[in-house]
């Protein structure tokens, strides 16, 4: 074994690595020191360290080591924020389109059905959106939502526009009958299908990723120990006590300790690799129904399949609904 | 046959795009992620040699410093000695993972599981028949493409893609616009929706 | 016509509960959202809670949640407050209000005449 | 999940217009979320003005109107009469589909 280099007479060099890291001075010995204090970089002989430099440098080693996390994840953050703002954005875009759509096919095929179909058109997307971004929506109540505020429209407008005023009041049967009589058949329930399954899957194809981000935040953050201080502190720095400026590290001891310092981190690994796997088996099924950019752009065809259905059923429904809802008016007015 | 929107008030001006070679869609973007994310898939395992290999160690030196002592790079010593009575590494090990990271760990087990339940095998058909009532016109069986768009003579495809493109072309709001509508036809019947989301590299 | 109907308000102790009651009319009720909504002597309007038209979503605000429970009776067309837990500053008067919409909270169309709830020993 | 702000007191003599604001944050005013006015009377249940931002329910005299911009709402009463003196209240709800309230404002017709 080669014997080790006698260490700096005077501590000289020590000084100048050392000013670097802390202006000011007192805290190197002039020449070296017997170290009896020192807690990390225990000496063997003589030493151009004190405890107070041994402070410093364990509050570097942990600084060095937080910044080599953060650069070394610095790629993979950039990937995962980036598509997330992308993907939200381009979500929010076929909604906007898909809205458009719809209110395109009412004003070109039923006018006398616009504005009021603007507007449920609107807070169905709205609702749409609010769904894709988290809110605690069920998708069944929106759809129904939908019908329940077209049928009347429907009814009033299409199948007996000659309704005077009055009979207005009727909106709240027409609401009750739109289910009990399944008026629309069974597009609304296609359309719930549809539209759950798509949204389900495009939102937590959002909520992943905002979880990735987290994780990389999470160990990006990551504040290491003392011991782990210690440790880097050891690998990194006790050499210049020796006057060893120029020496690095061994890899293995180098591994060594960081799988000491990550052991926590490293955790991590299991899980990631099946997020990363559940990710990609998500994203391989996310076709027809469970792709929301196709069914959500192919709405407007389907509603307007199911008002054509009520229009073909007019004469049977308005006879039935006739009864059923003059009734009720009468009631109201008792 | 039904008048399908392709009034869609847009500014004809606005709709002169121009060819674009690489056409992509919100489906290739999601494989173009995955597969980018698939060579992160062993980030964590890796860390520990990463930041040793971008942090200064001896690579080509004769000589490396053991934690305790100027050793020769391939000796026991090197990897070993810098351990000796100075703390308990297995003990640091034995610690778990801090609160946060045991965190995280709990928040990823449950997306996995969410995912798991959402990936369902290929060829997944609509839980129930939908047709169970009888449709009279544009019936539609279990999971078909055609159902998402129903029926009729002059039936516009809706083009399943998302384009990504170079410049923006249009940006569609009947809010905005109710009175100026313009007749803009798709080209080959198809209605497909452009943006400009710049490529993530 | 449309119609909200409170009861169940009066003077409870604190840590006692209570139970309100909204009887709906003239509207079909399981199409819409309902809320309860309070209001303090002198002060403002408070949301207190909300409920889908399904009843399958429920909402609270921060100060009642765990301590106060909505639920609705489609079939006999009544809203309900179960109130665990009473504090003092639950003195109030609840108003039960319809929804516009049926899926979520949007904007209270039909309100009800309210009724007292005091918390006192 | 915190209240709107709205200024606590308005005033206006009959003929002129009186706004009132209401702001909010960008999950709830902010968001895809609409935003209701209401008017109240002492002792009496509130009425509701405005909902999905501008849309007045039928009855409603159109000297009340409502925009939203960004994080702020307002309403307009324009050509103010005496029994327009009332508390007014603004709501929208956040991401997560709770209610919030502003604190409401008191409208004095002077004269």
């Known amino acids: 074994q080669p014997p080790p280099p006698p260490p700096d007479a005077t501590c000289h060099q020590v000084r100048s690595f050392f000013q670097r890291l802390q202006p000011g001075l007192k805290w190197v010995p002039e020449t070296p020191v017997p170290g009896s204090d020192l807690q990390v970089c225990l000496p063997k002989g003589p030493t151009c360290c004190s405890r107070k430099m041994e402070e410093k440098y364990q509050l570097t080693a942990r600084l060095n080591m937080e910044q080599l996390l953060q650069s070394a994840s610095m790629e993979l953050k950039f990937l995962i924020i980036q598509n997330a703002a992308v993907f939200q954005e381009a979500f929010e875009i076929v909604v906007r389109h898909a809205k458009n759509y719809t209110n395109a096919m009412f004003k070109n095929n039923y006018p006398s059905l616009t504005p009021q179909a603007f507007e449920f058109v609107g807070e169905f997307f709205t609702d749409v959106s609010l769904y894709i971004l988290g809110s605690d929506i069920n998708v069944d109540d929106m759809v129904n939502e939908l019908f329940d505020s077209l049928f009347p429209v429907i009814y009033t407008q299409l199948m007996n526009p000659g309704l005077p005023d009055s009979a207005l009041d009727i909106n709240e049967c027409l609401r009750g009958a739109r289910r009990d009589l399944k008026v629309f058949g069974n597009f609304p329930k296609l359309i719930m299908t549809q539209v759950s399954k798509s949204l389900q899957v495009t939102r937590i194809f959002l909520q992943a990723l905002n979880l990735g981000i987290e994780v990389i935040n999470t160990t990006d953050h990551l504040k290491f120990s003392k011991d782990c201080g210690r440790m880097l502190t050891r690998m990194w720095y006790c050499s210049y006590c020796q006057g060893l400026m120029m020496v690095k590290p061994c890899g293995g001891y180098c591994n060594v300790v960081m799988q000491g310092c990550m052991a926590g981190v490293v955790e991590i690994d299991k899980y990631w690799r099946e997020y990363i796997l559940s990710l990609e088996e998500l994203v391989n099924g996310m076709y027809r129904i469970y792709d929301m950019e196709n069914v959500l752009l192919g709405l407007f065809s389907t509603i307007h399949d199911s008002i054509q259905y009520v229009q073909k059923n007019a004469g049977k429904l308005t006879t039935t609904i006739g009864k059923l809802c003059a009734h009720s008016q009468q009631r109201q007015y008792r | 046959s039904a008048y399908y929107p392709e009034d869609l008030f847009i500014d004809k001006k606005v709709l002169k795009v121009a060819h674009v070679e690489h056409e992509e869609t919100l489906s290739s973007r999601r494989r173009e992620l995955i597969q980018k994310l698939k060579s992160f898939i062993s980030f964590y395992s890796a860390l520990p040699g990463y930041i040793c290999s971008h942090s200064p160690v001896a690579e080509n030196d004769t000589l490396c410093w053991n934690g305790q002592e100027l050793v020769e790079r391939y000796s026991q010593k090197a990897a070993r000695n810098g351990m000796k009575n100075q703390f308990n590494l297995h003990e640091l090990k034995m610690k778990g993972p801090e609160p946060v990271v045991s965190q995280i760990i709990d928040k990823l087990k449950h997306i996995n599981q969410l995912l798991r339940t959402m990936s369902m095998p290929k060829g997944r058909v609509l839980d129930k028949n939908l047709d169970e009532e009888g449709f009279e016109s544009g019936d539609c069986g279990d999971d078909e493409d055609e159902c998402i768009g129903g029926s009729g003579d002059g039936m516009i495809k809706v083009k399943n893609q998302l384009r990504f493109l170079a410049e923006l072309a249009y940006d569609l709001d009947v809010d905005d616009a109710p009175g100026n509508s313009q007749q803009a036809t798709p080209k080959d019947n198809e209605i497909s929706t452009f943006h400009n989301l710049g490529n993530v590299h | 016509q449309v119609q909200l109907q409170e009861s169940g308000g009066g003077l409870v102790q604190p840590g006692r509960s209570l139970r309100l009651s909204c009887a709906a009319s003239g509207f079909t009720f399981s199409s819409y959202a309902m809320h309860w909504v309070r209001q303090a002597p002198g002060k403002g309007l408070e949301w207190v809670s909300a409920i889908s038209g399904s009843g399958g979503s429920t909402y609270y605000a921060d100060s009642v949640k765990g301590r106060f429970t909505i639920s609705r009776d489609n079939s006999k067309n009544t809203l309900y407050l179960q109130m665990n837990s009473l504090r003092a500053e639950d003195t109030a008067v609840y108003y039960c209000a319809k929804d516009r919409r049926g899926s979520h909270a949007d904007a209270f169309d039909v309100w009800g005449q309210g009724t007292l709830v005091t918390v006192s020993s | 999940q915190s209240a709107l702000t709205q200024p606590p007191s308005a005033s206006g003599s009959p003929g002129q217009s009186v706004t009132i604001s209401c702001t909010g944050t960008s999950s709830d005013v902010g968001g895809y979320n609409y935003v209701s006015w209401y008017q109240q009377y002492p002792g009496k249940a509130p009425k509701l003005l405005i909902y999905?931002?501008?849309n007045r329910p039928s009855g409603v005299p159109d000297r009340f109107s409502g925009s939203k911009s960004g994080t702020s709402a307002s309403l307009a009463i324009t050509g103010l009469q005496a029994e327009d003196g009332a508390d007014y209240y603004c709501q929208s709800y956040d991401s997560s589909l709770r209610v919030v309230f502003g604190g409401g404002t008191k409208v004095t017709v002077l004269g």
């Open positions: 999905g931002n501008s």
